[in-house]
């Protein structure tokens, strides 16, 4: 029986050009984590396998860094990075657990917007 739960950072926002850490945590289970996939619906970003280590997709090699821990750091963000990201924990003996993070990449910070409209 699968007793575990995935905690994620949930809905997050970051600034264009900046970076963000995608983080999931599996709790309430003694199952062994053997692999963690980081995916979008249509493609793999990265895999952390207990035996093989990290694999980063060539499409993301320049701007994805493994970690911290089983998390993933996305760098040089663009507005096209807005969307859903999923962590998939492969465990034994439970099976797979999936967590969802929605990332919104903003054009610029609120502070910058504010500065543009200051009265001289």
């Amino acid at each position: 029986m699968m007793t575990g739960t995935i905690e994620t950072t949930g809905n997050i926002s970051a600034e264009k050009g900046g970076s963000i850490i995608l983080q999931c945590h599996l709790s309430s289970t003694t199952a062994q984590v053997t692999q963690v996939n980081w995916e979008q619906q249509d493609q793999l970003l990265a895999i952390c396998n207990a035996d093989l280590g990290w694999h980063i997709s060539p499409s993301f090699k320049d701007r994805v860094a493994p970690g911290p821990g089983l998390g993933l750091t996305l760098q040089s963000l663009t507005v096209n990075d807005t969307g859903e990201y999923f962590c998939i924990y492969h465990t034994y003996p439970d099976g797979t657990y999936t967590g969802r993070i929605f990332l919104e990449v903003l054009e610029s910070s609120v502070a910058e917007h504010g500065a543009r409209f200051q009265i001289p």
């Epitope: 692999q35 619906q41 493609q43 793999l44 093989l52 694999h55 499409s59």
Partner: antibody
């Protein structure tokens, strides 16, 4: 238990449109997952066509992009395939299937044979 | 597109034998390979995902291994009911692609 069932005409004329329905029972298509269409040609080759996600996003095989459309009716828990300008090369068994992240196609319909012929 | 190649279209084996089916990806797909079994007149049935993980209820005589570009599906002791076509599939990136299939024939 999750079940998928394809339905639609078994015979379509060349240059016409092929329209199929996948009815899902035991799970809401708006809850999670990507809901796919896959076809199998007479020689047994399997060909992924496209999907619609639980949130309504679609993605298609580039080889079909100009001809394919996948839509859904959430009130009936159904999703649909429309393939335009069919030729005899589109003769195949068409399957709908659920894809789970980090895995593969975990649930399949029983398939429906569509023959394109004049 | 990522091309998945199953070099053997047919394999002949006897009940009780060990048989291995291979699949090669045209690029590194890490461990994102699934295996399916299709019996005559039926839809494909998922057996293995992420190269080596068995789905619930799949007998433990079925195993998968490999990473990168080379993958193997093994039946440790073939049973008569294993007569089927076996397909590999990459779930690395769209378009998801399948191997051409290997038909297992029982002698």
């Amino acid at each position: 238990d999750v079940q998928l069932q394809e339905s639609g005409p078994g015979l379509v004329k060349p240059s016409q449109s092929l329209s199929l329905t996948c009815t899902v029972t035991g799970y809401s298509i708006t809850s999670d997952y990507a809901w796919n269409w896959i076809r199998q040609f007479p020689g047994n080759k399997l060909d992924w066509m496209g999907y619609i996600t639980y949130s309504g996003d679609t993605r298609y095989n580039p080889s079909l992009k100009s001809r394919i459309s996948i839509t859904r009716d959430t009130s009936k828990n159904q999703f649909f395939l429309r393939l335009n300008s069919v030729t005899t090369e589109d003769t195949a068994t068409y399957y709908c299937a659920r894809r789970e992240l980090g895995q593969g196609f975990t649930y399949w319909g029983q398939g429906t044979l569509v023959t394109v012929s004049a | 597109d990522i091309v998945m190649t199953q070099s053997h279209k047919f394999m002949s084996t006897s009940v009780g034998d060990r048989v291995s089916i291979t699949c090669k990806a045209s690029q590194d797909v890490s461990t994102t390979v699934a295996w399916y079994q299709q019996k005559p007149g039926q839809s494909p049935k998922p057996l293995i995902y992420s190269a080596s993980y068995r789905y619930t209820g799949v007998p433990d005589r079925f195993t998968g291994s490999g990473s990168g570009t080379d993958f193997t599906f093994t039946i440790s002791s073939v049973q008569a009911e294993d007569l089927a076509v076996y397909y590999c599939q990459q779930h690395y990136s769209v378009p998801w692609t399948f191997g051409g299939g290997t038909k297992l024939e029982i002698k």
